[in-house]
């Protein structure tokens, strides 16, 4: 079951999936001046069996100006730099991607890929949040959102990460940070 909406946006933070549930689709988008090859896939699909998951189909882009199709090759380093949405890796990575059964890893870039990836998530997908540069987390509480099915509708749980800038922190007294370690699990709302 596909999630109806995108994961929630919160102030001064970005989100990233660390692994993708089977059924997730990734649009085959090309950067400006390029287009999908004729008869090329519209999307990649995370599929698999109980022991292994992988991405079906391959995305291929060709120059809009030429009639020739291009083969898919390993992207050049400068092309990889353009990618925005998959650069947010490790410090926030809570699990080894490979260790999650029923999930695919981040697909490798393809030549002339668009700068942003458009995923279509499925129920049960979890995304993780971290503060953007110049902001820090207020405390070490849960920083994820999960796509859930409730009352026959899909919705994402609200991430509880609060990101604050330096000035804001110094202007706001009343901060108390106990020693107790917080729960790090996403909330599970009871369905009706």
């Amino acid at each position: 079951e596909l999630c109806d909406d995108d994961p929630p946006e919160i102030p001064h933070a970005t989100f990233k999936a660390m692994a993708y549930k089977e059924g997730t689709m990734l649009n085959c988008e090309c950067k400006r001046g390029f287009r999908r090859i004729k008869s090329g896939s519209l999307y990649m699909l995370c599929t698999g069996n109980s022991s292994h998951s992988s991405w079906d189909n391959q995305c291929q882009c060709t120059s809009s100006a030429t009639r020739n199709t291009t083969k898919q090759v390993t992207p050049q380093p400068e092309e990889q730099k353009e990618r925005k949405t998959t650069e947010m890796q490790s410090p926030m990575q809570p699990v080894d991607q490979a260790s999650l059964p029923g999930h695919c890893r981040e697909p490798p870039p393809w030549e002339n890929e668009a700068t942003e990836r458009i995923y279509h998530f499925v129920v049960g997908q979890m995304v993780y949040y971290q503060c953007v540069q110049g902001y820090r987390a207020l405390h070490r509480g849960p920083a994820e959102s999960v796509c859930k099915m409730t009352h026959g509708k899909t919705r994402w749980t609200q991430p509880q990460l609060i990101c604050t800038g330096e000035m804001e922190t110094s202007q706001f007294p009343g901060e108390e940070k106990p020693q107790a370690s917080p729960e790090g699990r996403p909330e599970s709302e009871t369905s009706c």
Partner: antibody, heavy 116, light 107 residues
Framework: EVQLVQSGAEVKKPGESLKISCKGS????????IGWVRQMPGKGLEWMGI????????KYSPSFQGQVTFSADKSTSTAYLQWSSLQASDTAMYYC?????????WGQGTLVTVSS | DIQMTQSPSTLSASVGDRVTITCRAS??????LAWYQQKPGKAPKLLIY???SLESGVPSRFSGSGSGTEFTLTISSLQPDDFATYYC?????????FGGGTKLEIK
Amino acid sequence: EVQLVQSGAEVKKPGESLKISCKGSGYSFSNYWIGWVRQMPGKGLEWMGIISPGDSTTKYSPSFQGQVTFSADKSTSTAYLQWSSLQASDTAMYYCVRGPYYLDYWGQGTLVTVSS
Amino acid sequence: DIQMTQSPSTLSASVGDRVTITCRASQSISSWLAWYQQKPGKAPKLLIYKASSLESGVPSRFSGSGSGTEFTLTISSLQPDDFATYYCQQYNSYLLTFGGGTKLEIK
């Protein structure tokens, strides 16, 4: 169904202490910030601050710093707002809310009246 | 603190009217704005978040727009149930702040 249920109305004298409660149900209480909002008679809404029930991290609005104390008991899914010495100006309706950004669930409110 | 200023403070209108309430922030808050409806003796109810996203279960006659410092709440065709007080609230900063409220009354 997500619910925040607050304790009943209170009538107190100036100088007395008070602790009101907000019990959450229908969701994982520990994993959501709980905020408090004051509404004085005939007036607008004022943000008092928030508490994370998971680890009791608190943030107070400057106007309420030192005037009130937030606490939470995750074992009973209950958040508390307390005063050590009430004043007549504390007379208001107090709402607990689920945060920390837009406030999607509200308690029914606890009316606190402070009068000699 | 980020100050939120609502206008008008009182608005008289009739059933079927299209009404607009404005909220201004003292500094840019991107789209981090919510709108609430409050009826006498009741807790406020979330209508709109992220400036224009309609909360589940809220009638489609309510809509929000704006970004930066200027925001509006529009009710396309007033219903008898809509006469209430409306508040905006910013959440760009974790020190949340509310507008002063707009009382929508029957003309």
